[in-house]
Amino acid sequence: RPCPDPTAPPNGSISPVQAIYVLKDRFSVFCKTGFELLQGSVPLKSFTAVCQKDGSWDRPMPECSIIDCGPPDDLPNGHVDYITGPEVTTYKAVIQYSCEETFYTMSSNGKYVCEADGFWTSSKGEKLPPVCEPVCGLSTHTIGGQIVGGQPAKPGDFPWQVLLLGQTTAAAGALIHDNWVLTAAHAVYEKRMAASSLNIRMGILKRLSPHYTQAWPEEIFIHEGYTHGAGFDNDIALIKLKNKVTINGSIMPVCLPRKEAASLMRTDFTGTVAGWGLTQKGLLARNLMFVDIPIADHQKCTAVYEKLYPGVRVSANMLCAGLETGGKDSCRGDSGGALVFLDNETQRWFVGGIVSWGSINCGAADQYGVYTKVINYIPWIENIISNF
């Protein structure tokens, strides 16, 4: 007994086409490009029906339905616009992802098309939505302002500045991504096994301001080469935050140095350091203070400290900054903060040093502040961030 002649569904075709279909004969359905086989709402990759001995097909005809990529994924810190038409998500529809301007940016152009495989796809063939990365290194601060020898920061000057509070200690750090803080290893060493006891505040100028953005650490990563209590080589650490912070005018990461940045940190080039550490009066600063200081000659700095503290080594992983005449320096309580430089090409601020150690007499003549040389640790930083 023959089976009824199969009729191809709209936007589909049948193969093979026969004059008659009898027991065990079969046909397959193929859809036009941009259409997919659906049985109800469930997709099929292929469809073949077999003629049974009672003269019926063993399964009903599917539909060839236009591919629907569905609503595009939400974009954190951005949004999506429908270009083809309101809520149109079918084959060849176009959408445009955009990031919140000023504070976030994306590497691609953000244009995605609904392709025949049912995925929103970028012009580069990427199936995953773009990422809105935080903009880094924007600041209202300009070099030239006359912490020890410092002056108060204004809103937006150092939006990467982070206050790290322990039960009895205070230090600083620099936001380098929306969920990573760069700091000195010595500043967080005691907290490495109890990260949750570290209180992280950002978006503030006044140290005791009640209007801060709170962040909590998930994990602390101390550089493997750092030995606590035995010098300050590799005095660098990363704090991963439990949650991403929202970037705005008062909270923004500082950039990491580009390979070419070494040329911007030569002797006598000026950097800026900010903190709530001890001031000339020997008291912790109430307001965030900053000072513009020049990079010191490395050999001169090494010689000063060899004489001052025999056995204390100024390594190639450190850079020194300050005036021979003294008067401008970072001090206790500033530890972990960023020594930043303006990249003239990008007009962005990058972190060149981390406040590490120095003379007991902050700001003394011929006694420079010593900073961890961040450019030496870019591979370490990138490795930690990409793996965790």
Epitope: Q39, G40, S41, V42, P43, K45, R59
Partner: antibody, heavy 114, light 107 residues
């Protein structure tokens, strides 16, 4: 012979993430069909949670959309369920199945309790 | 979402008799309906797909019919192994949904 087998912890604490894996043997999950997660709270009816299709596209029950992720590992011929922020209401027997439902796993009871 | 309403909730039938189970969809689902049998402590077993197509290996005493919003599962002559809970299921539109079940018990 197509077989599906669910695996994962039987006890999950409230607010944590429930994670289950379905291992498929006798058929490649990329060959065809959609691959479902379905659950059944004690004494209640079946609830479709979502599927991942042969191409890797997913479709979720809107009632769970903010909490559910279905993914796959084609090298192991497995597909997985993650359900975040669970509560006692997520206590159920969890099944994986192949659409049209012709093959099901034996089910695994997941209890949400502290 | 499409609500699938099954009736009766419980059906008492003697072995050898016919059982007729009803399932109503809250909106048109075409013929995209499946029927499952479930016994205590077991996973569901697929009986019928596309409203009236029997899965291979399913005895001929099970038959399905209907389209649109009204569907029926008929067991022509109940065997002892048929006493179980039966669910209908629509896969016409997301979210896919199931009926509350009909328990077929021995009279």
């Amino acid at each position: 012979q197509v077989q599906l087998q669910e695996s994962g912890p039987g006890l999950v604490k409230p607010s944590e993430t429930l994670s289950l894996t379905c291992t498929v043997s006798g058929y490649s999950i990329t060959s065809d069909y959609a691959w479902n997660w379905i659950r059944q709270p004690p004494g209640k009816k079946l609830e479709w949670m979502g599927y991942i299709s042969y191409s890797g596209r997913t479709s979720y029950n809107p009632s769970l959309k903010s909490r559910i992720t279905i993914s796959r590992d084609t090298s192991k011929n497995q597909f997985s369920l993650k359900l975040s922020s669970v509560t006692a209401a997520d206590t159920a027997v969890y099944y994986c199945s192949r659409h049209y439902g012709d093959y099901w796993g034996q089910g695994t009871l997941v209890t949400v309790s502290s | 979402e499409i609500v699938m309403t099954q009736s009766p909730a419980t059906l008492s039938v003697s072995p050898g008799e016919r059982a007729t189970l009803s399932c109503k969809a809250s909106q048109n689902v075409g013929t995209n309906v499946a029927w499952y049998q479930q016994k205590p402590g077991q996973s569901p077993r697929a009986l019928i797909y596309s409203a009236s197509y029997r899965y291979s290996g399913i005895p001929a005493r099970f038959s399905g019919s209907g389209s649109g919003t009204e569907f029926t599962l008929t067991i022509s002559s109940l065997q002892s192994e048929d006493f179980a809970v039966y669910f209908c299921h629509q896969y016409n539109a997301n979210p896919l949904t199931f009926g509350g079940g009909t328990k077929v018990e021995i009279k």
